[in-house]
Interface confidence: low
């Protein structure tokens, strides 16, 4: 007789989740010599231990601590790029500007990027049918708690000038409910971080407005200033040209504003 299984509102665990995590770990540790000491089987065991046999609406940051410890990594604290609602461009940028890092350029972020996972209370099974949705079901689900934990730690790690890429095409360029707005902004350490510099990425070809004057950017500035961190903002009017100029800064067309 098939067991009754909780139906959640979100998609289920990504197909071949254990194999994907393990394969990503092996690939990452091969590419990054400083992480060659990492035992990927132990990483998977710690990852699994965070959510297997636990109610998927009752996950805590403590559940992920063994994984956090195993995934400890050295990233230059003054080379951190945060992003909100514009992941692809942020990742394209760090692929070119190799000395800057998004969370997904770290081992833990790389392992979990674009994956979904959850288990079931009191069974060792992974739930491939459905997982809790953050809004419709619960916020303390395995995926949300994971990203909250690693995002908090990543923000805590930052120092000097921290950059954030924001999507200028959205109605809320800065969204207080995003991971950046709800976690990262509040965990930058004022004694270490001098400035948060926002890069507002324009979508339209003919859009020459100063999106740094947008009310939500002013709201971000206010939050940051109250935390004794300086704020600066730049419009990236042509993201395609921006990336091109990061690749080839000597190009004569790159001396004008991008």
């Amino acid at each position: 007789v098939p067991r009754w299984r909780q139906q959640w509102s979100g998609p289920g665990t990504t197909k071949r989740f254990p194999e994907t995590v393990l394969a990503r770990c092996v690939k990452y540790t091969e590419i990054h010599p400083e992480m060659r000491h990492v035992d990927c089987q132990s990483v998977w065991d710690a990852f699994k231990g965070a959510f297997i046999s636990k109610h998927p609406c009752n996950i805590t940051e403590e559940d992920y601590q063994p994984l956090m410890k195993l995934g400890t990594q050295t990233v230059p604290c003054n080379k951190i790029l945060l992003w909100s609602r514009i992941k692809d461009l942020a990742h394209q940028f760090t692929q070119v500007q190799r000395d800057m890092f998004t969370l997904e350029d770290t081992l833990l972020g790389y392992l979990a990027d674009d994956l979904t996972w959850c288990g079931e209370f009191n069974t060792s099974k992974i739930n491939y049918q459905s997982c809790p949705d953050w809004r419709k079901d619960c916020s303390n689900n395995p995926v949300s708690v994971f990203w909250k934990t690693v995002s908090r730690r990543f923000a805590e790690a930052a120092c000097d000038v921290v950059h954030v890429m924001l999507n200028g095409s959205r109605s809320k360029i800065f969204d207080k409910n995003s991971t950046f707005g709800s976690v990262e902004v509040h965990n930058l350490q004022p004694e270490k971080v001098q400035t948060l510099e926002a890069w507002v990425i324009h979508g339209g070809r003919e859009d020459s407005r100063d999106l740094c004057q947008d009310p939500t950017i002013k709201e971000l500035e206010s939050i940051i200033s109250k935390r004794n961190i300086q704020f600066s903002c730049k419009n990236i009017y042509r993201p395609d040209k921006f990336l091109q100029c990061v690749k080839n800064p000597e190009d004569s067309s790159c001396t004008s504003e991008i």
């Epitope: 400083e34 956090m68 410890k69 400890t72 990594q73 050295t74 990233v75 230059p76 604290c77 003054n78 000395d99 770290t106 730690r153 990543f154 805590e156 790690a157 120092c159 000097d160 350490q189 270490k192």
Partner: antibody, heavy 123, light 107 residues
């Protein structure tokens, strides 16, 4: 303002060990890295290793691997550097220094230094 | 490990003059370079980090430049308290390494 206060000068016999302490006062300790650097008389500066207390994670320069142990006690905000199998060439001033270290990254530049501890190795 | 080479070993300068110290890395260290000043009997003092950013409380006469493998520390107008030994240090790759130092002495 954070200050790093080191233990006093030591005179040691060859083959013995020395343990130098470095206490942080006036600020947080755990969220930083503590690095150890030595300077032989009339010579330049040489990295030995570093620890991030919150992780209890130490890294050592190859030259000192196996001979140096760096530890930290968060409850007393004190870091320790123990060097074993001492020889006359280990006669030097040993400095601890604070770097910005936290979870994901290694410390980098060092903004606050202890006053130094002279260790003399002589038979 | 990355070898840091400083030149000259000794620089003789008169007070009020400009001093230019060089530091070369055996491979690229990006901008992950710091400069320290050390006076006899004292611990090193951080002057510059990130190759060009002055540390808190450091006078504007100290400036750093360069990236990759070639770096320069410039003291625009030497004061009596600036006569000391200066070290560069890379923190791009572990083990971090110092240059052998440049002694700035009174001419």
């Amino acid at each position: 303002q954070v200050q790093l206060v080191q233990s006093g000068a030591e005179v040691k016999k060859p083959g013995s060990s020395v343990k130098v302490s470095c206490k942080a006062s006036g600020g947080s300790f755990s969220n930083y890295a503590i690095g150890w650097v030595r300077q032989a008389p009339g010579q330049g500066l040489e990295w030995m290793g570093r620890i991030i207390p919150v992780l209890d994670a130490a890294h050592y320069a190859q030259k000192f691997q196996g001979r140096v142990t760096i530890t930290a006690d968060e409850s007393t905000s004190t870091a320790y550097m123990e060097l074993s199998s001492l020889r006359s060439e280990d006669t030097a001033v040993y400095y601890c220094a604070r770097g910005l270290g936290y979870y994901l990254y290694s410390s980098y530049y060092f903004d606050i230094w202890g006053q130094g501890t002279l260790v003399t190795v002589s038979s | 490990e990355i070898v840091m080479t400083q030149s000259p070993a000794t620089l003789s300068v008169s007070p009020g003059e400009r001093a230019t110290l060089s530091c070369r890395a055996s491979q690229s260290v990006s901008s992950n370079l710091a400069w320290y000043q050390q006076k006899p009997g004292q611990a090193p003092r951080l002057l510059i980090y990130g190759a060009s950013t002055r540390a808190t409380g450091i006078p504007a006469r100290f400036s750093g430049s360069g990236s990759g493998t070639e770096f320069t520390l410039t003291i625009s107008s030497l004061q009596s308290e600036d006569f000391a030994v200066y070290y560069c240090q890379q923190y791009n790759n572990w083990p971090w390494t110092f240059g052998q130092g440049t002694k700035v002495e009174i001419k």
